[in-house]
Interface confidence: low
């Protein structure tokens, strides 16, 4: 066998180069045929009326032809024939790659609620071969489920991602990334998740600073509630009892002046938004006032009293009431 060819892979619209090489030349007629076995070139003459074929080189050892503006219909086997005795034939296969015409990402809903499972679809249109779609949530790769539809030798790939969203996902991009032999670099499209979540409630004791609550002192608690949407209502209640009459409520702040033992108990900050409700508890224990020791007449004694303050905060959450958006509690 004196005749050699190489397979060619080319991107649609670009140029394919077909080469028929002869090892031991005897000036035999060489010709190139298309997949329909029509003669493209007979030596250096082109009988085929397709001007996209151009002669790059013709010699006794090579026939080299370019095919410009390659389309998918050009795909197939091209035959080199050498009219030796006996005739020799070798073929080269042209494979045409078609990058996806369009990449679309479609998210089931613009705003999701924590714990909800949403569907995200990404469609890569009309490529050849079929596109591989990869999913990322931020930097984390996720597993999607792809369906391939073939139409006229082209493939439309739709990948479905079922995504259970958490509050940490708010503002995180969901990325659909395409891998295709005709695509160099990164072809991707993305959508940002918007996740609504019920409040997270945290109580902070802003006074006294050292955390020790004694009779006669004042107490100030601040309730911090973070959620999406931002909690519309933050309320203070006393669990299983009335709020002391001398307690002052000011927005997220609870102020109790002149503490006494009857103020002991659990104080709850409740916050809610359209997703649900949550609360945090503060257990107040009022200690005795510091004892004052009268000064001795002859001896000076310094007494240091160390008191350990127990600050207990119990946080609880519950899903939204009936009629509001329900969320799965984690």
């Amino acid at each position: 066998q004196n005749l050699f060819t190489k397979d060619v892979t080319v991107i649609e619209g670009e140029v394919a180069t077909i080469s028929c090489q002869v090892n031991k030349s005897d000036d035999s007629v060489i010709q190139l045929l298309n997949p329909n076995r029509q003669t493209i070139y007979f030596r250096d003459f082109r009988p085929l009326k397709d001007s996209r074929f151009q002669l790059l080189n013709f010699s006794s050892s090579e026939l080299k032809v370019s095919l410009t503006n390659v389309s998918i219909s050009d795909e197939g086997r091209y035959f080199c024939q050498l009219y030796t005795d006996p005739p020799q034939e070798s073929y080269t296969t042209i494979t045409v790659l078609v990058p996806p015409r369009n990449l679309m990402i479609d998210i089931q809903k613009d705003t999701a609620v924590e714990g909800e499972e949403i569907e995200v679809n990404c469609t890569a249109m009309a490529s050849k071969p079929a596109t591989t779609i990869r999913w990322f949530k931020g930097n984390t790769e996720l597993k999607g489920k792809s369906e391939v539809e073939e139409w006229s030798d082209m493939y439309t790939v739709t990948s479905q991602l079922m995504l259970k969203v958490h509050k940490e996902d708010d503002g995180v991009p969901v990325i659909c990334q395409v891998e295709h032999p005709a695509v160099t670099g990164n072809l991707q499209t993305q959508r940002y998740l918007e996740v609504q979540y019920k409040p997270q409630v945290h109580i902070q004791m802003t006074y006294p600073l050292q955390g020790l609550t004694r009779e006669g002192d004042a107490l100030e608690l601040t309730c911090e509630a973070i959620g999406k949407p931002q909690p519309v209502m933050v309320t203070w209640v006393r669990v299983d009892d009335e709020m002391p009459q001398h307690a002052v409520l000011s927005g997220p702040n609870l102020f109790i002046n002149n503490l006494n033992k009857t103020d002991n108990g659990t104080y709850r900050c409740e916050a809610s938004n359209i997703v649900g409700k949550a609360h945090s508890d503060y257990m107040l224990y009022v200690y005795d006032p510091p004892t004052t020791i009268p000064p001795p007449t002859t001896t000076t004694t310094t007494t240091t009293t160390t008191t350990t303050t127990i600050l207990t905060i119990i946080t609880d959450s519950r899903a939204g009431e009936e009629g509001s958006i329900r969320a799965v509690d984690h």
């Epitope: 649609e12 619209g13 503006n69 389309s71 082209m154």
Partner: antibody
Framework: EVQLVESGGGLVKPGGSLRLSCAAS????????MSWVRQAPGKGLEWVSA????????YYADSVKGRFTISRDNSKNTLYLQMNSLRAEDTALYYC?????????WGRGTLVTVSS | SSELTQDPAVSVALGQTVRITCQGD??????ASWYQQKPGQAPVLVIY???NRLSGIPDRFSGSSSGNTASLTITGAQAEDEADYYC???????????FGGGTKLTVL
């Protein structure tokens, strides 16, 4: 200035041929797919044909397939529509449009009248 | 089917809100694009994608999509908004373009 200018329209008899041109300027022509869209008098818009940026892919509406040929010359920044075997129902204002999946740039159109 | 269906005519009082709709199977997969065409003029792209306006298009124009229906909403219609409005999309292959029949908007 970014613009498209169509030419080549006119009066032609049924069965005749006509070649429309669309000259593009102000943008990198070879980077964009292009389409032809037509509008019969008093009627709506009808997509006719499209071609990829390189010219390697062409697409046609069923109503013109086999009679019309879309092509482009990127060196001349020009889009073409070769119309053969014309019929009375091909009478329309023919627009060329830049194809980004949506048509974000249109020419003013060239009128083709097919009548005996 | 790759057809897109629009109401032939819609009217709106000056300053009021109007919604023009477009229905078709392809809109289950694709967003529609919307074009405004005034008499004797070429069409102009108004909305594309989910709800994107080309620069120069007033923000009273907005787009939305649900199921197989796309909508163009004009909030506070002006006299200059009187025109024909066309939606368009692609068939399932992505290679063929389809237009709606157009909606003639009259501002009263």
């Amino acid at each position: 200035e970014v613009q498209l200018v169509e030419s080549g329209g006119g009066l032609v008899k049924p069965g005749g041929s006509l070649r429309l041109s669309c000259a593009a300027s102000g943008f990198t022509f070879s980077s964009y797919a292009m389409s032809w869209v037509r509008q019969a008098p008093g009627k709506g818009l009808e997509w006719v044909s499209a071609i990829s940026g390189s010219g390697g892919s062409t697409y046609y509406a069923d109503s013109v397939k086999g009679r019309f040929t879309i092509s482009r010359d990127n060196s001349k920044n020009t889009l073409y529509l070769q119309m053969n075997s014309l019929r009375a129902e091909d009478t329309a204002l023919y627009y060329c449009a830049r194809d980004n999946w949506y048509f974000d740039l249109w020419g003013r159109g060239t009128l083709v009248t097919v009548s005996s | 089917s790759s057809e897109l269906t629009q109401d032939p005519a819609v009217s709106v009082a000056l300053g009021q809100t109007v919604r023009i709709t477009c229905q078709g199977d392809s809109l289950r997969s694709y967003y529609a694009s919307w074009y405004q065409q005034k008499p004797g003029q070429a069409p102009v792209l108004v909305i594309y994608g989910k709800n994107n306006r080309l620069s120069g298009i007033p923000d009273r124009f907005s787009g939305s999509s649900s199921g197989n229906t796309a909508s163009l909403t004009i909030t506070g219609a002006q006299a200059e908004d009187e025109a024909d409005y066309y939606c368009n999309s692609r068939d399932s292959s992505g290679n063929h373009v389809v237009f709606g029949g157009g909606t003639k908007l009259t501002v009263l």
